[in-house]
Amino acid sequence: SIPWNLERITPPRYRADEYQPPDGGSLVEVYLLDTSIQSDHREIEGRVMVTDFENVPEEDGTRFHRQASKCDSHGTHLAGVVSGRDAGVAKGASMRSLRVLNCQGKGTVSGTLIGLEFIRKSQLVQPVGPLVVLLPLAGGYSRVLNAACQRLARAGVVLVTAAGNFRDDACLYSPASAPEVITVGATNAQDQPVTLGTLGTNFGRCVDLFAPGEDIIGASSDCSTCFVSQSGTSQAAAHVAGIAAMMLSAEPELTLAELRQRLIHFSAKDVINEAWFPEDQRVLTPNLVAALPPSTHENLYFQ
Amino acid sequence: GAMGQEDEDGDYEELVLALRSEEDGLAEAPEHGTTATFHRCAKDPWRLPGTYVVVLKEETHLSQSERTARRLQAQAARRGYLTKILHVFHGLLPGFLVKMSGDLLELALKLPHVDYIEEDSSVFAQ
């Protein structure tokens, strides 16, 4: 049966036994800045082009053992959530991956900047259709990272990022705090904000909307046919990147402002239990859970 | 995220170093009265001191970025400091990434075209 997260983002009139918009997002390229990925996993084979871009810090610790499947874990899962054949949102989207996070899931602001610059240069050399950039990472507030995101957004690129997993104000983190970026918090199957250990999803006025981010089934790098459940605002952001890809594939001329407006318009309203957020943040945090449009032009989204 | 709101730096640290005239033989002195600012991550464990993103003013060309980077290296060398230019940015933001001692920040902030300098910091998978 359909995983809870795909059911949650699917408008009721399209719900059936399966979630199957087979070609959703086919006109859009989604860039993923993350760990290395297992690009020949059955769920994503042929859908993800691994670029030659790599800018990562060395792993911490003298006894760190680099195990390929662990190195690929985070990125493989997210690629699967965006465009996986069986558990992906935008099954028609093609992806390009850049490695900016090491085997411990750690990167640098400078490496991320160079990655964003690489995307901009690729866009200039070979202009394609609409671009979505997924940044499933967070660091402390960074003026320069926010500025780079702003420049890329002004060049017509849609940037989607994780709000962060620190149970804190997203405005204290980057790229979550960049106004031009679509910042995504995480909710669970009960429409509760996601708790992650002692922490959880970030919140506040720098969050644009929430999306499923707990117990999300996706491709596992443990084997070429494996699936695994992962949680976090990265998973939530991947859902929104997939939804954005489908919207842009249906309407390639959408501006960032129009896309943001559509994402908000089609979201489920006031379903999140706000008691989870600090009292002073409740009014500032959007009570929106992302969903696909119940398009009257069915073939736009379900080609 | 969330457009239509002012940027909030939160507890982001900003150090403004006023430009003092030093005999550094700058061919292109910065405009009178401007201050380049220094920024670093508010979360101490995430800081990566020793690597800095030098961001230049918006209309700076690649050739000027390269020249500014070389000038920093030359001035640092005169003071007995080794520096390494790791990357020259162009396409999104003009500037360069430099590995150097924090002792050179004051010098770097006085370079022509410099808008601000940010110490590198960590980002994490979420």
Partner: antibody
Amino acid sequence: EVQLVQSGAEVKKPGASVKVSCKASGYTLTSYGISWVRQAPGQGLEWMGWVSFYNGNTNYAQKLQGRGTMTTDPSTSTAYMELRSLRSDDTAVYYCARGYGMDVWGQGTTVTVSS
Amino acid sequence: ESALTQPASVSGSPGQSITISCTGTSSDVGGYNSVSWYQQHPGKAPKLMIYEVSNRPSGVSNRFSGSKSGNTASLTISGLQAEDEADYYCNSYTSTSMVFGGGTKLTVL
């Protein structure tokens, strides 16, 4: 043009081993593994397993476990399938195909096992 | 795993439409979006005709279409032509492997 080119026909005695090669070209190797499929005379298609160009990982059909080995050599863009302890019922055409999706196929390699 | 069930043979006259069924279980056909169909002419390698239930690779005639309901997938060929005479195989993911149907011989009368 995406192509998979296989090695030539083989005649082997029972108990021997055979190693079939499959050279891939025209696409990004690491985006797809290689599936191996065989077809006995007058019979249907049987999936034997899959091997990765990315990390060398394998996924064998239960029936093949222990008797077959699939490997890749990314430096030459070549995948290999070795079958040991051959029996007469291993007589078949052996195909390599691109990935699990098997959207492109090699021309096939006839392996005859006969005493 | 057991082979998917296909009819051994089907036939049709030129211009007609025919449908070949492929029945599995909820662990293969019913559980995945990844059912493919292959055409094989005698002495030739199989050729992909339909992937992911209903998608056609570029270069494949739009006379070929695929669908799925529950645990059964179907290949429909409309406007039957002489060159369509061949063996047809369905294929599906299983949790850890791949499984083919036994094959259907299509005869164009």
